[in-house]
Amino acid sequence: MAVTACQGLGFVVSLIGIAGIIAATCMDQWSTQDLYNNPVTAVFNYQGLWRSCVRESSGFTECRGYFTLLGLPAMLQAVRALMIVGIVLGAIGLLVSIFALKCIRIGSMEDSAKANMTLTSGIMFIVSGLCAIAGVSVFANMLVTNFWMSTANMYTGMGGMVQTVQTRYTFGAALFVGWVAGGLTLIGGVMMCIACRGLAPEETNYKAVSYHASGHSVAYKPGGFKASTGFGSNTKNKKIYDGGARTEDEVQSYPSKHDYV
C-alpha cells in the first residue's frame, strides 16, 4: 500500500513539475525590466526564451519573436536546449510511469517489469528536473552578470550632456516557476525510485523444505534454528524472507498480477 502511495504521489508530483517546466518554457517573463531605483517609465519591457515584449501604459502590448537562430546568444540557445530536453525527458517519463503504476493493469505485466519501468521513469524525472533547474540557473546567472554590467554603465551619453538610461533586467516570474517545477520533478523522480525498491519482487534466500511426520508436523529450515511445531492440519509453513522468520499471516502481502487494487 505504501509503495502504491509513494509511486502514485511521485507520479502526481512529477506531472505537476513537468507541467510547470512547460509553462516556464513558454512564459514571456524570464527577465523583466528592473523598476527599482530607475526613472519611472510608461513602458515595461520583459523577455522570454522565444520573444520579447513591451507593455505600454496605454494597455497595448507588443511582442516580437526572435526570428533568428544564429544571431541569438549561445547562452540563450543553451537554456532553450536544456528546457526542451527537460520537457522531452519528462514527457517520456510520464508515459513510462503511467504503465508502471500499480493501479493500472496491462495484460500480464510482471511486477519486475513494473519495477524497472518505475525506476526508468524516476531517473527520467530526476534528469528532467535537473535540466530545468540548470536551464533556469544559467539564465539567472546571465541576468545577474548583465545587471551589474548595465549598472556600471547606467548612464551613457555624449560628453555627459544627454543621458540615456539603459534598461536593466531582473528575474522574471518564469525563473521562479522553473525552479519550483524543476524541484518538484526532481522530488517526484526520487519518489518513483524509492517506490521501485518496494515494487521489485523479493527473492527468498533459502528454499524451505518441509518434512511431514504422521502426527507431529515439523518444518525444518536450514540456515537458522527456526522451526515451527504444529499439530495436525493446522500447521502453517513458515517462509524465511531475507533471513527473518514470520508466519504467512505476518508477511506483508504485495499485490500480485492477479490482485486488483
Epitope: Q33, T41, V43, E56, S58, V165
Partner: antibody, heavy 118, light 113 residues
Framework: EVKLVESGGGLVQPGGSLKLSCAAS????????MAWVRQAPRKGPEWVAF????????YYADTVTGRFTISRENAKNTLYLEMSSLRSEDTAMYYC???????????WGQGTLVTVSA | DIVMTQSPSSLTVTAGEKVTMSCKSS????????????LTWYQQKPGQPPKLLIY???TRESGVPDRFTGSGSGTDFTLTISSVQAEDLAVYYC?????????FGAGTKLELK
C-alpha cells in the same frame, strides 16, 4: 466612434474641492489607460494624472501630487478626478484623454473649465 | 523631469511652403525593448483640444495627411510639413511618452505670412 465627455467643472474658491467626471463610450473602456490633461489659458497642455486600465498603476504630476486623486469605474465607463486644496494656478481647461499606441493621447474630450478664484 | 525643448517658438509661412520644426528631449526617448522612440506630435487649433498627429516619433495616426512626417531618434526629433495648407495653421506640441511625468514641449506656432 470614440466619445469622451467631461463634466463637473466650475468656479471654486481657493482651498476648495471639485470632482470631475469623464463619461466614455465607443470603445472597451476597461482595455485602455486613461489620463487627465489640463491647459491653462494661453499656455501649452500639461499632463495631470494617469490611471492604467485596471487601476493598478496610477501616476501624478508633481504639481498635483497629494491634492488630486484619479480613479475609474470600469462598470460605468467613467473616469474621475477628485481635486482638493485648489489653487489659482489650477485654473485651466481639464481634458480627459484615452491613451493609444506609443502612450499617445489618441482621443480627447472637449474639456471642462475649472476656475479657481476668490 | 524630462524637459522638452521646441524650436522655433513661432513660424511664419506661406501656403505650399515646406516647414520643419524641432523638438529636443533632455533624455533619450528610445526604448531598447522594441527600438521605438516614445515621442508624440499634436496639432492644436484655437478653441479645440489637441489632435494626435504622430506617435512613436514617425508613425502617422490614421486620417492624418501624408504631408506630415515625423523623424528623429533618441533626443532629437523633427516634424516636417511638406506643403503647408491653410488648415495647418495651428500650434504644434511634442510630448515625451516614455518617462513620467509625461511632459509636453512649449509648442511651435505656425502662422500665415
Amino acid at each position: 466612434e470614440v466619445k469622451l465627455v467631461e463634466s463637473g467643472g466650475g468656479l471654486v474658491q481657493p482651498g476648495g474641492s471639485l470632482k470631475l467626471s469623464c463619461a466614455a463610450s465607443g470603445f472597451g473602456f476597461s482595455d485602455y489607460g486613461m489620463a487627465w490633461v489640463r491647459q491653462a489659458p494661453r499656455k501649452g497642455p500639461e499632463w495631470v494624472a494617469f490611471i492604467s486600465n485596471s487601476a493598478y498603476s496610477i501616476y501624478y504630476a508633481d504639481t498635483v501630487t497629494g491634492r488630486f486623486t484619479i480613479s475609474r469605474e470600469n462598470a460605468k465607463n467613467t473616469l474621475y478626478l477628485e481635486m482638493s486644496s485648489l489653487r489659482s494656478e489650477d485654473t485651466a481647461m481639464y481634458y480627459c484623454a484615452r491613451l493609444g499606441y506609443g502612450n499617445s493621447f489618441a482621443y480627447w474630450g472637449q474639456g471642462t473649465l475649472v476656475t479657481v478664484s476668490a | 523631469d524630462i524637459v522638452m525643448t521646441q524650436s522655433p517658438s513661432s513660424l511664419t509661412v506661406t501656403a505650399g511652403e515646406k516647414v520643419t520644426m524641432s523638438c529636443k528631449s533632455s533624455q533619450s526617448l528610445l526604448n531598447s525593448g522594441n527600438q521605438k522612440n516614445y515621442l508624440t506630435w499634436y496639432q492644436q487649433k484655437p478653441g479645440q483640444p489637441p489632435k494626435l498627429l504622430i506617435y512613436w516619433a514617425s508613425t502617422r495616426e490614421s486620417g492624418v495627411p501624408d504631408r506630415f512626417t515625423g523623424s528623429g531618434s533618441g533626443t532629437d526629433f523633427t516634424l516636417t510639413i511638406s506643403s503647408v495648407q491653410a488648415e495647418d495653421l495651428a500650434v504644434y506640441y511634442c510630448q515625451n511618452n516614455y518617462y513620467y511625468p509625461l511632459t509636453f514641449g512649449a509648442g511651435t506656432k505656425l502662422e500665415l505670412k
